[in-house]
């Protein structure tokens, strides 16, 4: 009788994460009597995967019924494979011993590689908003993929970006890998509706890349432009002054009217109109009772946008007395000045 050999016919086995791996092993003889064990790795630190004689191995099933006579097939299936299962598996025949069985012969090993999909890319932008013409950084992260080869691209509104840096970790061998990329994006006033997209392509995705997005509306701050104008006289002693607040984003805005430096009224932007580019317009008006003023009046529209320092625009009302058929009327002239 020829001495028993342990045959592991597959040098490599490639399995997708979540699938079942079949590791094949046959013995060439029924002699010696004794159980089969499967290990991951070799040497003293090897990990027991299955022991025919004893133990509980819920993820492992044998391909053949080991109790059946003449059985020499010791192949196993390992269910619900994860990247952590990658490694070289050895089928080892033991010889019945007393008190303990003795290792007799090992197969040559089967290297199990696990293909794992990357997680959905997560794109994050800067912690604070930035204004147009500034450059901001976006990061993209994806984890848990294997093998290591992966492709990452950045897009802004469908246009590929080139200013980015990407790292795949760890550098050496690992059961799974992570990718981290940082892209630089220059903001424009039209970017409220813009999107930054991180696209990850991997062998496990069958040509259908994963995408993570960030809306620049979360990142951009478009400061308003102010215009203060005087409307025609509405009543004998009243002048209507409006402050047009244009092209701002986000909506959070507070406006204060000052008469000669004294607060007249404060209000919060509510009924705004939205522009096509996603920015907002708003208008506030102030009725000034001219008869209450002997001297010229400096009206200031002061706007605090999104917690930033206030910007303001001023308007000078010239107050002069004109004789009237009955009593007197006060007229007003205006000049404008812009203060920031």
């Amino acid at each position: 009788e020829e001495e028993l050999q342990v045959i592991q016919p597959d040098k490599f086995v490639l399995v997708a994460a979540g699938e079942t791996a079949t590791l094949r092993c046959t013995a060439t003889s029924l002699i010696p009597v004794g159980p089969i064990q499967w290990f991951r790795g070799a040497g003293p630190g090897r990990e027991l995967i299955y022991n025919q004689k004893e133990g509980h191995f819920p993820r492992v099933t044998t391909v053949s019924d080991l109790t059946k006579r003449n059985n020499m097939d010791f192949s196993i299936r390992i269910g619900n494979i994860t990247p952590a299962d990658a490694g070289t598996y050895y089928c080892v025949k033991f010889r019945k011993g007393s008190p303990d069985d003795v290792e007799f012969k090992s197969g040559a090993g089967t290297e199990l590689s696990v293909r794992a999909k990357p997680s959905a890319p997560v794109v994050s932008g800067p912690a604070a908003r930035a204004t147009p013409q500034h450059t901001v950084s976006f990061t993209c992260e994806s984890h848990g993929f294997s093998p290591r080869d992966i492709t990452l691209k950045w897009f802004k509104n469908g246009n590929e970006l080139s200013d980015f840096q990407t790292n795949v970790d760890p550098v050496g061998e690992s059961v799974s890998y992570s990718i981290h990329s940082t892209a630089k994006v220059v903001l424009t006033r039209e970017d409220v509706h813009s999107q930054v997209i991180c696209e990850v392509a991997h062998v496990t995705l069958q040509g259908d890349p994963l995408r993570g997005t960030a809306n620049l509306s979360e990142t951009i701050r478009v400061p308003p432009t102010l215009e203060v104008t005087q409307q025609p006289v509405r009543a004998e002693n009243q002048v209507n002054v409006t402050c047009q607040v244009r092209k701002f984003y986000p909506q959070r805005l507070q406006l204060t009217w000052l008469e000669n430096g004294n607060v007249s009224r404060t209000e919060t932007a509510s009924t705004v109109t939205e522009n096509k580019d996603g920015t907002y317009n708003w208008m506030s008006w102030l009725l000034v009772n001219v008869s209450a003023h002997r001297d010229d009046v400096k009206l200031t529209c002061q706007v605090e946008h999104d917690g930033q320092p206030a910007v303001s625009k001023s308007h000078d009302l010239k107050v002069s007395a004109h004789p009237k058929e009955q009593g007197s009327n006060t007229a007003a002239e205006n000049t404008g000045s812009n203060e920031r």
Epitope: Q52, E54, L66
Partner: antibody, heavy 119, light 110 residues
Framework: QVQLVQSGAEVKKPGASVKVSCKAS????????INWVRQAPGQGLEWIAM????????HYNQIFKDRATLTTDTSTSTAYMELRSLRSDDTAVYYC????????????WGRGTLVTVSS | DIVLTQSPDSLAVSLGERATINCRAS??????????IFWYQQKPGQPPKLLIY???NRDSGVPDRFSGSGSGTDFTLTISSLQAEDVAVYYC????????FGQGTKLEIK
């Protein structure tokens, strides 16, 4: 360490039944056949039957086919052999034995259970 | 059914001498390249102990003075140098089909 611990001695009357137990430890019970063998006083070994605890597949010696029933309880790793319609010539030591190589052989044995059939 | 016949029924051998026990099958027990014969030793008050499996393979812990040989229908258990602790009854068993035992051979010291 494989161990097979059998139930204690029994005295039965002719026509009665006996159920001998064999509790296994030190190995995965469902992975190996259990055989039952008996030995009458001063006589040789006589194979009764065998059972695969994984699926309860059984093989019986034709002599015992109508009177013996093998069962297992995998939750307690225990095998049972029931013999019905006992006769005086069923007086014997009944052994359970585990087949470690699936060769239909007997590698590890229990200590035996003496069943005495006497009126 | 395959019947196994052992010879002799009993045997007395001097210490240090060779003891030979024979087992003949009523038909061949060879199948799938193996001879499905097993030898057991039973000492008084103890269960049997497996000595030899598949005709010629010593079980673990069995002293190498025990050996098995034969093929087809004729098989032999040999104890090359009898020791006092070898006094026992020896049985052959086949599993070419469902198992059966030989009638046993009682080995004593002369």
């Amino acid at each position: 360490q494989v161990q097979l611990v059998q139930s204690g001695a029994e005295v039965k009357k002719p026509g009665a039944s006996v159920k001998v137990s064999c509790k296994a430890s030190g190995y995965t019970f469902t992975n190996y056949w259990i055989n039952w063998v008996r030995q009458a006083p001063g006589q040789g070994l006589e194979w009764i039957a065998m059972i695969d605890p994984s699926d309860s597949e059984t093989h019986y010696n034709q002599i015992f086919k109508d009177r013996a029933t093998l069962t297992t309880d995998t939750s307690t790793s225990t095998a049972y052999m029931e013999l019905r319609s006992l006769r005086s010539d069923d007086t014997a030591v009944y052994y359970c034995a585990m087949d470690y190589g699936s060769l239909y052989a007997m590698d590890y044995w229990g200590r035996g259970t003496l069943v005495t059939v006497s009126s | 059914d395959i019947v196994l016949t052992q010879s002799p029924d009993s045997l007395a051998v001097s210490l240090g001498e060779r003891a030979t026990i024979n087992c003949r099958a009523s038909q061949s027990v060879r199948s799938s390249g193996y001879n499905w014969i097993f030898w057991y030793q039973q000492k008084p008050g103890q269960p049997p102990k497996l000595l030899i499996y598949l005709a010629s393979n010593r079980d673990s812990g069995v002293p190498d003075r025990f050996s098995g040989s034969g093929s087809g229908t004729d098989f032999t258990l040999t104890i090359s140098s009898l020791q006092a602790e070898d006094v026992a009854v020896y049985y052959c068993q086949h599993s070419r089909e469902l198992p059966t035992f030989g009638q046993g051979t009682k080995l004593e010291i002369k």
